[in-house]
Interface confidence: medium
């Protein structure tokens, strides 16, 4: 079938398009191109006669068209008006006609856009700002970029007017950013210059520094005030409600008790019209006051920060005392006192250092105690724990994983699957899982205060088939009559039955055998040497079953009471004495001999050639098992008679 393909289909103004003819019939007389969807002589562009190889322009010919011998038509320097349908009329040698229609669309090359704004200085939490991307262009798509990123998802951001207008409701200072718009059509894309949004905000509640509120007579008082504000705030100071001066700093030299009172800093933003105040109460002491504790770090980070607790106020020739948990200070390399005892420094705080802490000032008559102070130690997160501990799941069930990590403040959690972030929750829930949900499930716990994060990765397998299990043991070499052994069948799988075999038989009934943990754990209490057998575990569900390789229990035992052989105890002079000692033991014991209490050799066999009556005495075999830590021994009396003096004597070995 005769067809027309437009290459490209979307054409930029000024470029060219090729109307490519496919399946052109054989034996042609000629062909003609027409603008539109039908053959219309008034709209003929060009005709071509094959025999003469002659091309003839028609009424719709613009001088930009070129026809090729294969009937394809090239149109150059495209204009908007060229959009639409084009019809090829083919006349075959038998004068039977055939037609085909193709089309293309023309789009303008877009100009560089710009951003207009309805509010150049919006006020935080009050104003909205509408950015509009100019100019308005037909058939164009509008995109927005914030700090060169695509728009974040936010209920305060709204696109309208075909995405040409971006409205930020209730602007905040965090909206101060670079905004760009982009226009796109099928043939071009252009991006605007940046517009920086200048959000007016504040003043926030001012901060008065230093934080110290206790002073002694004769000191200088120098207070400074700061409040976050755009544009920068103007400051005023009031003492006990009376205006003092319009400066950021307040300085009063050589203060007295009369300078005690409330000191107010007022911050004013002339553009937002807002005022904020902060009040600090300054106390000037003429005599030692009740002490109080200040800390250089109210939220120290575990294993990272040191904390200096200072007993205020500073008084010359005074004894300072400290208590932790209502006890005097323990001796610890992590606790240091300054020379005057006024500052207690905790080096590398831990979560156990919360306190409470008290300091005291000793005077002639008594000790004044401060109020207790508790430290808020930031710690963690520790390595997160993912529960439940199953690693194998069957298709079709729901996967519900929970993550927990010890942390102060409480951790924020994120879940990743195969390294890709999923959600920021403590729980991960996926319903109706399939094999495609198999993968690496990572829980990431983050402590926003310390900036630390820890991760735990769990491999989840979703399969109808169960894996080959394996046996893990809490004790690879238990000692007889002493140890217990717990065998666990791995992995832990949901909706799975666990089975056990010993030497190929099902478990015997025994008070020393106990199944627990859904039969996944087999515990042998007070193992004996007879428990040294082959143990196999099996797992099964409704569609498959599998058995582990056998694990043989290696029970350490003995040494039992040794046996000396041969049993003879009477020998003739001149015979050879050859005593062998044996004791049941695992591992094999070490042997040693003593004759009449005197240590001999460390061998299993004792050999003495040509014995005499001098060899009479007690022969002791000692056995020891280094693995069980146990020892044993046996004593045998040997009598050697002069040759021929007594019947029934052994001739020796």
């Amino acid at each position: 079938k005769l067809t027309i393909e437009s290459t490209p289909f979307n054409v930029a103004e000024g470029k060219e398009v090729l109307l490519l003819v496919h399946n052109l019939p054989q034996h042609l007389f000629g062909y003609s191109w027409y603008k539109g969807e039908r053959v219309d002589g008034n709209r003929q562009i060009i005709g071509y006669v094959i025999g003469t190889q002659q091309a003839t322009p028609g009424p719709a010919y613009s001088g930009r068209e070129i026809i090729y011998p294969n009937a394809s038509l090239l149109i150059q320097n495209i204009i908007q008006n060229d959009t639409g349908f084009y019809t090829l009329h083919v006349i075959k040698s038998d004068l039977v006609n055939e037609e085909a229609t193709g089309q293309f669309r023309v789009y303008p090359e877009l100009p560089k856009p710009s951003i207009s704004s309805n509010n150049s200085k919006p006020v935080e939490d009050k104003d909205a700002v509408a950015f509009t991307c100019e100019p308005e262009t037909q058939d164009a798509t509008y995109l927005w970029w914030v700090n060169n990123q695509s728009l974040p998802v936010s209920p305060r951001l709204q696109l309208s007017n075909g995405n040409r207008t971006l409205t930020l409701f209730n602007v905040t200072r965090n909206d101060t950013a670079s905004y760009k718009c982009e226009t796109q059509n099928p043939v071009s894309a252009r991006r605007s210059d940046s517009v920086i949004l200048n959000v007016l905000y504040g003043p926030d509640a001012p901060t008065i520094s230093p934080l110290n509120t206790s002073y002694r007579s004769g000191e200088n008082l120098n207070l400074s005030c700061h409040a976050a504000s755009n544009p920068p705030a103007q400051y005023s100071w009031f003492v006990n409600g009376t205006f003092q001066q319009s400066t950021q700093e307040l300085f009063i030299p050589n203060i007295t008790v009369n300078n005690s009172g409330s000191y107010t800093c007022q911050a004013h933003n002339s553009d937002t019209g807002l005022n904020r105040t902060t009040v600090t109460t300054i106390t000037v002491y003429a005599e030692p006051p009740k002490p109080f504790i200040t800390s250089n770090n109210s939220n120290p980070v575990e294993d990272e920060d040191a904390v200096a607790l200072t007993c205020e106020p500073e008084i010359q020739n005074t004894t300072y005392l400290w208590w932790v948990n209502n006890q005097s200070l323990p001796v610890s390399p992590r606790l240091q006192l300054s020379n005057d005892n006024r500052t207690l420094t905790l080096l590398s705080v831990t979560r156990n250092d919360v306190g409470p802490y008290e300091c005291g000032i000793q005077n002639e008559l008594s000790v004044d105690h401060s109020d207790p102070v508790i430290l808020n130690v930031l710690y963690g997160p520790d390595d997160p724990t993912i529960s439940p501990s199953y690693t194998y799941y069957r298709p079709g069930v729901n996967l519900s994983l929970s993550c927990h990590a010890a942390s102060n403040p409480p951790a924020q959690y994120s879940w990743l699957i195969d390294g890709n972030i999923q959600q920021h929750t403590q729980e991960l829930f996926i319903s109706n899982i399939t094999e495609k949900n198999s993968g690496l499930y990572t829980c990431q716990a983050n402590n926003s205060a310390s900036g630390h994060s820890r991760t735990t990765v769990k491999t989840i397998t979703v399969s109808a088939e169960l894996p080959k299990p394996s046996i893990s043991s809490n004790n690879s070499k238990p000692v007889e009559d002493k140890d217990a052994v717990a065998f666990t069948c791995e992995p832990e799988a949901q909706n799975t039955t666990y089975l056990w075999w010993v030497n190929g038989q099902s478990l015997p009934v025994s008070p020393r055998l106990q199944l627990s943990n859904g039969n996944r754990t087999l515990t042998l209490f007070n193992v004996t040497r007879n428990d040294a057998r082959a143990y196999v575990c099996g797992i099964q569900n409704s569609v498959s079953a599998n058995r582990s390789d056998p694990v043989t229990l290696d029970v350490l035992y003995g040494p039992d009471t040794p046996i000396i052989s041969p049993p003879d105890s009477s020998y003739l002079s001149g015979a050879n004495l050859n005593l062998s000692c044996h004791s049941a033991s695992n591992p094999s014991p070490q042997y040693s001999w003593r004759i009449n209490g005197i240590p001999q050799q460390h061998t299993q066999v004792l050999f003495i050639a040509k014995i005499t009556p001098n060899n009479n005495g007690t022969y002791a075999c000692f056995v020891s098992n280094l693995a069980t830590g146990r020892n044993n021994s046996i004593v045998k009396s040997i009598t050697v008679s002069a040759s021929g003096t007594s019947p029934g004597l052994s001739a020796g070995a």
């Epitope: 195969d418 495609k436 198999s438 993968g439 491999t459 989840i460 397998t461 979703v462 894996p467």
Partner: antibody, heavy 124, light 110 residues
């Protein structure tokens, strides 16, 4: 029998879009993540990305981000790769593949079933 | 991205030799008891073929002379007794995050 078969033009002009289709037989495409990997002449293997035919989710290697699109037609058991604005550096054998059909293993990202590969040359 | 460094890039050995290829990842590719490292063989003009998955598991139908080991960042692929049909390029690949391949080791027989 499990098979993957790549098809598409062997020659693409610079700046144009490379398009390849992978036809799957012997299993249901929806059950597995489907991947594209390429190998420039005389060079090593480069992973391009995956598509989950069940829902159309995709993930691409950072190198190809912005140029690559993967689509799926589950009715035909086919998935496709489109790589735009190609240059001579995109000349390569392109393989479609999938992971562990015969192994009960948890990672979606090793490949024991491969197509035979389709050589695409980028040249004017 | 985790980068893979495979060495050597090429090697020659005789029939019957023991051949070892190593692959090092820029960070650990082990997690929760698995090592996400795999090995492929590619003969000229053919698609790669999976030999070893998860560091040490032999893919079904692959001869037992091929083996793999390792954990964390360092992995080894071994051919215990080289055969003439083992002439190929071998690639490691991790799947701990988005997958990347090693640059390949071309094995020739002397």
């Amino acid at each position: 029998q499990v098979q993957l078969q790549e098809s598409g033009p062997g020659l693409v002009r610079p700046s144009q879009t490379l398009s390849l289709t992978c036809t799957v037989s012997g299993f249901n495409i929806k059950d597995y993540y489907m991947h594209w990997v390429r190998q420039p002449p005389g060079r090593g293997l480069e992973w391009i990305g995956w598509i989950d035919p069940e829902n159309g989710d995709t993930e691409y290697a950072p190198k190809f981000q912005g140029r690559v699109t993967m689509l799926v037609d589950t009715s035909k058991n086919q998935f496709s790769l489109r790589l735009s604005s190609v240059t001579a550096a995109d000349t390569a054998v392109y393989y479609c593949n999938t992971r562990g059909l015969s192994t009960m293993i948890t990672t979606r990202w090793f490949f024991d079933v491969w197509g035979q590969g389709s050589l695409v040359t980028v040249s004017s | 991205d985790i980068q893979m460094t495979q060495s050597p890039s090429s090697l020659s050995a005789s029939v019957g030799d023991r051949v070892t290829i190593t692959c090092r990842a820029s960070k650990s590719v082990s997690a929760s008891g698995y090592s996400y490292m795999h090995w492929y063989q590619q003969t000229p003009g053919k698609a790669p073929k999976l030999l070893i998955y998860l560091a040490s598991n032999l893919q079904s139908g692959v001869p037992s002379r091929f083996s793999g080991s390792g954990s964390g960042t360092d992995y080894t692929f071994t051919i215990s007794s080289l055969q003439p049909e083992d002439i190929a390029t071998y690639y490691c690949q991790h799947s701990r995050e988005l997958p990347t391949f090693g640059q390949g080791t071309k094995l020739q027989i002397t």
